[in-house]
């Protein structure tokens, strides 16, 4: 039975050329997190596995940094980075939990963080 919820940074915005931290947090479950995948549409950006550690996909390694924690830092943002990002928590014994973050990369300097929200 999947009882947990994923809290994410929700809808966020950031300036072109800047950086942003994508963060998710799994709560309300005692399940062990065995792996976290970070994905964007049809791209697998990074994996953090309890045994193997972090892997950043080769096409992103120049602009993506692991952490903090199980989060992901995107650097040198471009407007093409605008879109949906998913944190996928693989857990034992529950299974898979998915959180969604929408990132908007802005040309101007009026970027603000959105509200946090939860996905069960």
């Amino acid at each position: 039975m999947m009882t947990g919820t994923i809290e994410t940074t929700g809808n966020i915005s950031a300036e072109k050329g800047g950086s942003i931290i994508l963060q998710c947090h799994l709560s309300s479950t005692t399940a062990q997190v065995t792996q976290v995948n970070w994905e964007q549409q049809d791209q697998l950006l990074a994996i953090c596995n309890a045994d193997l550690g972090w892997h950043i996909s080769p096409s992103f390694k120049d602009r993506v940094a692991p952490g903090p924690g199980l989060g992901l830092t995107l650097q040198s943002l471009t407007v093409n980075d605008t879109g949906e990002y998913f944190c996928i928590y693989h857990t034992y014994p529950d299974g898979t939990y998915t959180g969604r973050i929408f990132l908007e990369v802005l040309e101007s300097s009026v970027a603000e963080h959105g509200a946090r929200f939860q996905i069960p």
């Epitope: 039975m1 080769p58 529950d94």
Partner: antibody
Framework: EVQLQQSGPELVKPGASVKISCKAS????????IHWVKQNHVKTLEWIGR????????SYNQNFKGKASLTVDLSSSTAYMEVHSLTSEDSAVYYC?????????????WGQGTSVTVSS | DIQMTQSPSSLSASLGERVSLTCRAS??????LSWLQQKPDGTIKRLIY???TLDSGVPKRFSGSRSGSDYSLTISSLESEDFADYYC?????????FGGGTKLEIK
């Protein structure tokens, strides 16, 4: 015991579509992603894409965007893949595979495969 | 896409013999690799994941190892049921990609 039971062989005409089913049992269907893999007549394996049964997000191999569509029916714990505009190149065996959502070990349990033959 | 170059493409060996298959990744995959066995009836079974972790129920004569970008599957002493096709799979990046396969036949 985890099982993925696929539908039977299909003989279809060029230009038509085919929909293959994959019924999951022995685990929580929403707890693990379902992936699809193609094996052609020379035994080459090719990853098509995956779907999150919990809330439906998909990721596709660019080679299969517009060619394959992935869906699920939660009420019957069944995943589906529809292949469109069939040509002889689509004649192959198609496998559904469970992503190991518990230990993060990728594709663990495989369906028995569904043979699709495209012929007029 | 990450290319997985598998060798040899075919291999004839005798019962009791030790054999090794290799996959080389064109880019870093950090150990996110599994080995699959396909029987003649088409059934596919995962043997190893995370480069060296044996699946439950898989005989201990199977082992996986890594040296840099080279990943190996070794069968220490071949038994009759081991004659099959073997594939490596990288799951570090989309699209997941497979090796070309090794057909293991009885000599």
């Amino acid at each position: 015991e985890v099982q993925l039971q696929q539908s039977g062989p299909e003989l279809v005409k060029p230009g038509a579509s085919v929909k293959i089913s994959c019924k999951a049992s022995g685990y929580s269907f929403t707890g693990s992603y379902i992936h699809w893999v193609k094996q052609n007549h020379v035994k080459t394996l090719e990853w098509i894409g995956r779907i999150n049964p919990h809330n439906g997000p998909t990721s596709y191999n660019q080679n299969f965007k517009g060619k394959a569509s992935l869906t699920v029916d939660l009420s019957s714990s069944t995943a589906y893949m529809e292949v469109h505009s069939l040509t002889s190149e689509d004649s192959a065996v198609y496998y559904c595979v469970r992503y190991d959502g518990y230990y993060g070990g990728a594709l663990d349990y495989w369906g028995q495969g569904t043979s699709v033959t495209v012929s007029s | 896409d990450i290319q997985m170059t598998q060798s040899p493409s075919s291999l004839s060996a005798s019962l009791g013999e030790r054999v090794s298959l290799t996959c080389r990744a064109s880019q870093e995959i950090s150990g996110y690799l599994s080995w699959l066995q396909q029987k003649p009836d088409g059934t596919i079974k995962r043997l190893i994941y995370a480069a060296s972790t044996l699946d439950s129920g898989v005989p201990k004569r199977f082992s996986g190892s890594r040296s840099g970008s080279d990943y190996s599957l070794t069968i220490s002493s071949l038994e009759s049921e081991d004659f099959a096709d073997y594939y490596c799979l990288q799951y570090a990046s989309y699209p997941y990609t497979f090796g070309g396969g090794t057909k293991l036949e009885i000599k």
